[in-house]
């Protein structure tokens, strides 16, 4: 008959190298950051420097022109979305350095990590708006002559921002701080508790609305635009194609790892080996997505130099030429004179 024997227990088999090991004191946890976390820190640092300076410059250049130039309104809003997201980076950087410890409280946990998702939705919706604008300029020039104005552009941007805020709410609501007992650590993350279905729903909506649907619609939209451009033998059509592909592709390339890991994690058990591996890559995927927040100014500069050969021009002057050139409504010219801004519509929304 089995019976309890608590008098001389053998603790030897109680072995857990990670945490809560009765034979491993509290201080014996690793102080080395994982390689994915180190890479994430490097990316965050670069994105912060380029993103804050670059987007601040874009905001400065476009803000003065936004009253009269519709393209400036688009670029101003994209830059504001990117700039806002970059402001969260020092906090996210600090958290990773501290092995994902979150000493900043519950409110910061809800708001700051949600900024990148707000950026994703704001950018993709703004990009869709810009793409619609491009489409109308090419296919409905008369309508544009009559109705395309700064007021309507601002309304479209406000709608995009409103929808982006609405779509970010689920992430915001489910973000919580969890204080772990051992080793002592406060974590900031999403917690759906019992509701795995809701977690999957949020991940699917994010994938569809923030990635797949925009990918499909923008591809179709630009296919039509480029086909019309080619058919009319518009000048610089090859360059236009290259810039469009670069701008749109960058959004989807940089968001792809985040979206793929996100959807996979929502369908996996939290204790499964695959889930744990993906969790270790989470910071890297977020940092990769954050590249979107600094890539727009780079694209604008490269596009400006490539199209106008203004290598020796000052940066603000170069950006002004790229970002504030107004589209001419006549179809043939709309792709000659505003090629750069068409392409530089950075699918940063991606």
């Amino acid at each position: 008959m089995d019976s309890f024997n608590y008098t001389t227990p053998d603790y030897g088999h109680y072995d857990d190298k990670d945490t809560l090991d009765l034979n491993t004191p509290v201080d014996k946890t690793s102080n080395t950051l994982r390689v994915p976390d180190i890479l994430a820190l490097v990316i965050f640092a670069v994105v912060f420097l380029v993103g804050v300076l670059g987007n601040a410059l874009v905001v400065w250049v476009t803000a003065f022109e936004a009253k009269r130039t519709i393209n400036a309104i688009w670029f101003l809003n994209l830059a504001v979305a990117d700039f806002l997201s970059c402001l969260a980076l020092p906090i996210l950087f600090t958290s990773i350095v501290q092995h994902h410890h979150w000493p900043f409280g519950g409110a910061a946990c809800s708001i700051l990590p949600s900024l990148i998702l707000l950026n994703m939705y704001a950018s993709i919706l703004l990009l869709a708006t810009i793409s619609a604008d491009r489409f109308l300029l090419v296919f409905k020039p008369i309508w544009c002559q009559n109705f395309r104005g700064a007021g309507l552009a601002w309304i479209a941007c406000a709608v995009a921002w409103g929808l982006a805020l609405l779509l970010t709410i689920p992430s915001f609501l489910y973000r919580v701080v969890r204080e772990e007992y051992f080793p002592p650590k406060v974590l900031c993350g999403v917690d759906y508790s019992h509701d795995k279905r809701r977690e999957r729903a949020v991940a699917i909506v994010r994938l569809v609305l923030g990635f797949l649907w925009p990918l499909l619609t923008l591809t179709i939209c630009y296919t039509f635009i480029l086909l019309r451009t080619w058919s009319r033998r518009a000048t610089r059509s090859t360059k236009t194609l290259k810039v469009v592909v670069a701008v749109v592709a960058s959004f989807f390339i940089f968001w792809l790892p985040y979206q793929v890991t996100g959807i996979m994690m929502s369908f996996l058990e939290p204790s499964s080996p695959t889930f744990l591996l993906l969790k270790k890559l989470d910071s890297l995927c977020v940092s990769f997505a954050y590249i979107n927040c600094c890539i727009n100014p780079i694209i604008y500069v490269v596009a400006g130099q490539g199209f106008q050969g203004r290598l020796r021009k000052s940066l603000p002057s170069l950006l002004r030429n790229v970002l504030t050139e107004e589209s001419v409504v006549r179809e043939s010219k709309s792709f000659t004179r505003s090629t750069v801004d068409t392409m530089a519509q950075k699918t940063q929304a991606v």
Partner: antibody
Framework: QVQLQQSGPELVKPGDSVKMSCKAS????????MDWVKQSHGKSLEWIGY????????RYNQRFKGRASLTVDKSSNTAYMELHSLTSEDSAVYYC?????????WGQGTLVTVSA | DVVMTQTPLSLPVSLGDQASISCRSS???????????LHWYLQKPGQSPKLLIY???NRFSGVPDRFSGSGSGTHFTLKLSRVEAEDLGIYFC?????????FGAGTKLEL
């Protein structure tokens, strides 16, 4: 062999304070949390908090914050818990337990009775 | 705080019977390390609680193999394959993943 020896029962008046001790032996005292748990008569267990002697780290359950004070004397490997402004609700058995993991080692408990 | 809901609160058994106790947590108990810190204790009258199962399914030293633990995330179960007289007492589930540590209300196993 790890042992946790707690101080004897206490009878105190409402509004008073009580300080109980838990002497540890058989392991390196500073290396592990010392946790405290309350068990009211016929009821479940309630975690009060822990003290980590290595860095004087303390964490309280919000329900006990301000009413419980955890301290240690590293020279004697003894942990202490003081309870303030006692009411009849505080009548219970209080256990110390070696933490940083599931509680394998528990003290025998200190019975505190609050009565006028 | 993580609420641990234990059922049933009382479990009358006969010696040799099977017994099963359920424990649900209001939040996931998966630690950032990937481990789940859900434990089971048995307390007999006048004694301190004693550890039976740690990390969901690991039997502690000296605990008979008629005890087994299972579950994941938020749903956990303790099973006794054949109840013996010395198994009687109050069983508590407990989580040590998150602060504050919390315990179930207890299940009294009685004849």
């Amino acid at each position: 062999q790890v042992q946790l020896q707690q101080s004897g029962p206490e009878l105190v008046k409402p509004g008073d304070s009580v300080k109980m001790s838990c002497k540890a032996s058989g392991y390196t005292f500073s290396d592990y949390y010392m946790d405290w748990v309350k068990q009211s008569h016929g009821k479940s267990l309630e975690w009060i908090g822990y003290f980590y002697p290595n860095n004087d780290g303390i964490r309280y359950n919000q329900r006990f914050k301000g009413r419980a004070s955890l301290t240690v004397d590293k020279s004697s490997n003894t942990a202490y818990m003081e309870l303030h402004s006692l009411t009849s609700e505080d009548s219970a058995v209080y256990y110390c337990a070696r933490g940083s993991g599931p509680f394998v080692y528990w003290g025998q408990g200190t019975l505190v009775t609050v009565s006028a | 705080d993580v609420v641990m809901t234990q059922t049933p609160l009382s479990l009358p058994v006969s010696l040799g019977d099977q017994a099963s106790i359920s424990c649900r947590s209001s939040q996931s108990l998966v630690h950032s390390s990937g481990n789940t810190y859900l434990h089971w204790y048995l307390q007999k009258p006048g004694q301190s609680p004693k550890l039976l199962i740690y990390k969901v399914s690991n039997r502690f030293s000296g605990v008979p193999d008629r005890f087994s633990g299972s579950g994941s995330g938020t749903h956990f179960t303790l099973k006794l394959s054949r109840v013996e007289a010395e198994d009687l007492g109050i069983y508590f589930c407990s989580q040590s993943t998150l602060i504050p540590l919390t315990f179930g209300a207890g299940t009294k196993l009685e004849l």
